[in-house]
Structures are given as C-alpha cells and as structure tokens.
Interface confidence: medium
C-alpha cells in the first residue's frame, strides 16, 4: 500500500542504456529514514530484489555484474520508513545495446549538403528488423523512432531532411530493434557526420505531424520532412 | 510446432574436438537464447552454454576455455565446438530454446528441446 | 558463482499426497528460476518459469513459489505420471546452473 511518503529516485549508473556484458548499477535513494529498499521490474513478479540500505541510509545500491537481455526493462524503487512503503519513484527504462548486428548509416545523395537543399539518411540492416531509430550527438532527445506497423519488418529505413540547415550538422547514429522489445537495442552504426555547407539559413525545419518536445531550440530531435518512405513505417517522437 | 534436431558424431577420440549442429525448424531461430545442456551417463542436468541470435554468448566457467557455441540465422542452426574432450565429457548432449528478451511472455524457461545425441569419447 | 542447491536429493510419497520440492541459491536470484521435470529416458520438461509461472499445457497440480533464495516446487496430488526427477535451474546471469536434482519416487 502506498503511504504518503514520498517517492524515491531512481538512476542507473553509467547510464541507462548499457552495453551487452558491461557492468550497470541502480541506485535507489529516498530519505533517512528508510529500512529497505524494494526494487520492481515490469513484467516480473515483485520484488525483484530487495536491498538494505547503505549509510546514511537514504539509498541502496543493485548491481548488474554483466548486462544480459534479462535485464532490459523498466524498473521501479520503493522504501520503506517505520510508517509504511513510500510512493514508487519515477520508473526507470534500462536498455541494453549489443542485441543485434549492428546497421549501416548512410546519407543520400552524400552527407555534405548545401544549407537549403535535401538530405535522407538511410539506415540499413542485415536482416529485416522492425524499428529504427535514428540518435543526434549532445542532443538531449535524441532518439526518432521509425517504427513499421502490422508487424511487417523491414531491412532499412529513410529519415529525409528537407530543408537543411546548419542546425542538421553533426554526428549521427543509427540502431535497429524488433517493435517486441524496445529495450534491446542492435550495436549502434558507425558514426555518420553530416556537414550542412553554405551560410544561407533558411527557417527551421518543422515536422509534417505536429511534435512536443521538452528540449530547447538548439535541442530537438531531427525533424524529417515528407511522405514516410515505406508505408508500413510510422513516426515515432521521443 | 517449432522442433529442434541434435546432430553429429557419437563417438569423438579423446583430445578431439566434439562437434555438434541444431537444426531448428518449424520456427525462427531469431530473438531466443539458443542454449547447450549436457547429461553424462546417471548424473544431473549440467548447463553449457548459450547463443542469442545477435552472436552474444555466454558459458559455463568450467568449459569456457574449450567451448565455442555459434549461430547460422541463415541455416536456421547453431553449434557447438567442445575442444580437447576426455571420457568425462561422454554424455547426452541436448540443444534448447529459451524465450526470454523482455515482453516475450517466456523470459526464463527452457521451453522445447531436442530430443538428445548421445556423445561418446573413446577411442 | 550462485550455487543452486535442492532438497531432498530423493524423496518417496503416496498417489495423492503432497509434494514438496525446494530450491536454495547461494544468492538472490529474484524470480529468475525454472524448474525442469525429466522422466527416465526422456528429455526434460519445463513446467515452471519465473519462480511460479505454470508453463502452457502443464497440469495445474504443479505450482512454483519463492523469490530471492528460496524456491518450492509443490505437487499438490501426487500422480503415477509424476514419477520423474525434478531440476531447479536460475538464469538471472550466466551460468544457468542447475540444481542437483531430486528424484521423486512412487510408495
């Protein structure tokens, strides 16, 4: 039963995104009046681990020695006080990369573009795969999802930017993933740089469907432009 | 009905190396652990190994040095190489599938296995 | 490395009785458990995942419990059929270590 107590925070240290075989720790911290920690994995019965608490005793430390699929998933954290369980934390999402080969980015017709003109950047995979997403450098929502429907798997997919900007330069990197698992990730592609030439700045782009974001203008995620080139390909905004 | 089929050699010469095939049929060998139990003559379950369709693999520390699990997606098989092998290594040699990448409705069990090879090395 | 420890090694019960069947890791393991059936001269059977999932076509006689250490396999009225011997098995992190077994016989 959820008491009034506030809830806890709930991070993962590196990161929550983990690759397969390296070591991940999650850490729970509450207040100091806490006596156990309770850790939650979705999909698995509770509790998933139980931890006493390090001193001063507002947190608990679970430790992942090797990340492994098994532990892909979103998590949540509770204490509890001598007045009862607190609140669950905010859940946390640990996704581990290394699942899959890993895909091939490219940029059509090359990754040196005149601001104001086109670009695709086509992610390929070995086999057909379900998701793709597409991950910007130091950008703080980086991930675009495109995502086929009915299940139909597909070996690439396009993200078309028109018109570029300056803000389109960087570094790029691609991922595959089955739809059924959005925690397991393929081993990231080699780095693509997109370099945007010309000082003409044109307006910013903006989607065809209307995106929220939290981040700031320098911050949002790549915003393609155009019909979606596979019709069993469907956008998703994170 | 998905199906799995040991295959290989029954007699293995000691300080050979022992190879076996699993033939999956009847389903995708992709998103699954693919995994490696052995039984010698009388004794319990003993785990080997696994493969995950991506290559990942992960042993027994007590054969880790001498053991070599891969996949062919395209073949729909996986293998396993057991290196250097002794008459403590005679045993029944099954194949098996686990579900278990999260959200699969089976993240743990071992639900359908081969039917078994027997292995013997002597020579 | 967890061990996986089960008890009894053997036990033998009566048509229709209760059976209990437990397993102890050396450390917490969650719900990351199977258990395994294997009758003689057959290949094993998976009845239980996820420390009490009944797995699809096993007769509801059989159930699992526990999380952390401290597993039970329970047969609720023991059957004929039931003669076998039953393996724990974590798979939290490799190795996916087996119990010992225990062996489960007819009076």
């Known amino acids: 039963q959820a008491g009034p107590l506030p809830k806890p925070t709930l991070w993962a240290e590196p990161g929550s995104v983990i690759s397969w075989g390296n070591s991940v720790t999650i850490w729970c911290q509450g207040t100091l009046e806490a006596r156990e920690y309770r850790l939650d994995k979705e999909e698995s019965p509770a509790p998933w681990d139980r931890q006493n608490p390090l001193e001063p005793k507002n947190k608990a430390r679970f430790s992942i020695p090797s990340m492994t699929e098994d532990y892909a998933g979103r998590y949540r954290c509770y204490y509890r006080s001598p007045v009862g369980w607190s609140q669950p934390s905010d859940p946390l999402e640990l996704v581990m990369t290394g699942a899959y080969s890993k895909p091939t980015l490219s940029a059509l017709p090359s990754p040196l573009v005149t601001s104001g003109k086109s670009v695709t950047l086509l992610c390929q995979s070995r086999s057909p795969m379900d998701t793709f997403l597409l991950i910007k450098e130091r950008a703080a929502h980086p991930l675009l999802h495109l995502r086929s429907e009915h299940g139909a798997q597909q070996h690439q997919a396009e993200f078309p930017m028109s018109p570029v900007t300056s803000v389109h330069g960087g570094t790029y990197r691609c991922f595959s993933s089955h739809g059924f698992s959005h925690y397991l990730l393929s081993h990231p592609s080699d780095p693509l740089e997109l370099i945007v030439s010309g000082s003409l700045e044109g307006p910013r782009p903006s989607p065809t469907r209307s995106v929220s974001t939290a981040a700031g203008p320098e911050d949002q995620p790549l915003m393609p432009t155009g019909s979606v080139p596979h019709s069993g390909l469907r956008r998703h905004w994170e | 009905q998905i199906q799995l089929q040991e295959s290989g050699p029954g007699l293995v010469n000691p300080s050979k190396t022992l190879s076996l095939t699993c033939t999956v049929s009847?389903?995708?060998?992709?998103?699954?652990?693919w995994s490696w139990i052995r039984q010698p003559p009388g004794k319990g379950l003993e785990w080997i190994g696994y493969?995950?369709?991506?290559?990942?693999?992960n042993y027994n520390p007590s054969l880790k040095s001498r053991v070599t699990i891969s996949v062919d997606t395209s073949k729909n098989h996986f293998s396993l190489k057991l290196s250097s092998v002794t008459a403590a290594d005679t045993a029944v040699y099954y194949c098996?599938?686990?579900?278990?990448?999260?959200?699969?409705?089976?993240?743990?069990?071992?639900?359908?296995w081969g039917q078994g090879t027997t292995v013997t090395v002597s020579s | 490395d967890i061990q996986m420890t089960q008890s009894p090694s053997s036990l033998s019960a009566s048509v229709g009785d209760r059976v209990t069947i437990t397993c102890r890791a050396s450390?917490?393991?969650?719900?990351?458990l199977a258990w395994y059936q294997q009758k003689p001269g057959k290949v094993p059977k998976l009845l239980i995942y996820?420390?009490?999932t009944l797995q699809s076509g096993v007769p509801s006689r059989f159930s699992g419990s526990g999380s952390g250490t401290d597993f039970t396999l329970t047969i609720s009225s023991l059957q004929p059929e039931d003669v076998a011997t039953y393996y724990c098995?974590?798979?939290?992190?490799?190795?996916?270590?087996f119990g010992q077994g225990t062996k489960l016989e007819i009076k």
């Open positions: 098996a599938r686990r579900g278990g990448y999260y959200g699969s409705g089976n993240y743990g069990g071992m639900d359908v």
């Open positions: 009847g389903g995708s060998i992709r998103s699954y652990f």
């Open positions: 493969i995950y369709d991506s290559g990942n693999t």
């Open positions: 450390q917490g393991i969650s719900n990351y």
């Open positions: 996820a420390a009490s």
């Open positions: 098995q974590k798979y939290n992190s490799a190795p996916w270590t």
